[in-house]
Amino acid sequence: LPAQVAFTPYAPEPGSTCRLREYYDQTAQMCCSKCSPGQHAKVFCTKTSDTVCDSCEDSTYTQLWNWVPECLSCGSRCSSDQVETQACTREQNRICTCRPGWYCALSKQEGCRLCAPLRKCRPGFGVARPGTETSDVVCKPCAPGTFSNTTSSTDICRPHQICNVVAIPGNASMDAVCTSTSPTRSMAPGAVHLPQPVSTRSQHTQPTPEPSTAPSTSFLLPMGPSPPAEGSTGD
């Protein structure tokens, strides 16, 4: 005869475990139903009655099958230097990531705890390593024959234009100035940019009213064991 399917709650056979989506209740000494993601246990099972589950209340969630008495609280609203890439729902916590132009200086299990503005390389310095979602920009001095005349977190050092006759020689922060109207070779006008990390925004987000002013977090951050690279600015 085929074995009968046991309905929760039931006493497990000695040495056996409860089935998937069930848990062993020590008090009742029975296998009982877990609650689904988005729910929590309102009433624990007894020998004669199964777990009673309730829906997670506003701004709380459970991501897994569970028998917790209360759902977990969603994290606080994203700060002004962040974007909400995943909204708080019954089944998932809110995730905040840094907005463009910022990077995550202190991460957490999901998302970012503390964002900081990407370093800007001052004139005479260009971007050696672009910023990412989790790392700051690294600046380097412009090598001879190259320059950067901007304060930017994306501009690299560009070659000086080559003149037939040089009026003013170029330096690390200024392009060469030619006497003739047309140089032999020049770079395309405009600064050369490196791509910035882009935060992806999920389709379902909850609007977060931003405060009109938010203090900069950059002063809170240690810049590592050594002082910041020369040629960087804090803002």
Epitope: C35, P37, G38, C53, D54, S55, E57, S59, T89
Partner: antibody, heavy 118, light 106 residues
């Protein structure tokens, strides 16, 4: 377009049962929880319960436990609510409504009028 | 369960007039949600997370409040705003609705 189409009006006798349906169109049925709400005689609204189609689990308002049973048929993207042991107190318009995983009913069905009369 | 009390139950306003209706909760709630319902129609989502307007809701509507006291305001009444408005919470199970404020046009 995101819509919830409910079954037509029902006239039932006291003590009988009725099963009303709510068919979802143009969205992934299992991604949205389905709630049922009662509105008696144009008055206020009462939440009956919720079903999570992805998991088949339910939560009920204590007041409607034993009165309402919520089920889903994923193959037809349809949610059902069965009402048992009907009395005149159960005469109302019943709505299905999705909540998108949040705590707010963002799409409502067309409503089903249930009249209990001998 | 949390009881939501809406006031006034019935009000009328002239076109262009500012309208404010309130929703008071018996216990503190995290957010309030609002719906508009017209006769022989299903409720429509109107305001969510206390102050965010649902899609298609005119900018003359606004929502505010915290704790146990919330309100819906229309900056300048229009004829199409005549309807019944319900508040709703889900900070505690079961979710509950207010008894509604019926807004008429003068």
């Amino acid at each position: 377009e995101f819509q919830l189409q409910q079954s037509g009006p029902e006239l039932v006798k006291p003590g009988a049962s009725v099963k009303i349906s709510c068919k979802a169109s143009s969205y992934s049925f299992t991604d949205y929880n389905m709630n049922w709400v009662k509105q008696s005689n144009g008055k206020s609204l009462e939440w009956i319960g919720i079903i999570f189609p992805k998991y088949g689990t339910t939560s009920y308002n204590q007041k409607f436990k034993g009165k309402a049973t919520l089920t889903v048929d994923q193959s037809s993207s349809t949610a059902y609510m069965q009402l048992n042991s009907l009395t005149s107190e159960d005469s109302a318009v019943y709505y299905c409504a999705t909540d998108g995983g949040t705590w707010y009913f963002d799409v409502w069905g067309t409503g089903t009028t249930v009249t209990v009369s001998s | 369960q949390i009881v939501l009390t809406q006031s006034p139950a019935l009000m009328s306003a002239s076109p262009g007039e500012k309208v404010t209706m309130t929703c008071s909760a018996s216990s503190s709630v995290t957010y309030m949600y609002w719906y508009q319902q017209k006769p022989r129609s299903s409720p429509k989502p109107w305001i969510y997370l206390t102050s965010n307007l649902a899609s298609g809701v005119p900018a003359r509507f606004s929502g505010s409040g915290s704790g146990t006291s919330y309100s819906l305001t229309i900056s300048s009444m229009e004829a199409e705003d005549a309807a019944t408005y319900y508040c709703q919470q889900w900070s505690s199970n079961p979710p509950t609705f207010g008894s509604g404020t019926k807004l008429e046009i003068k």
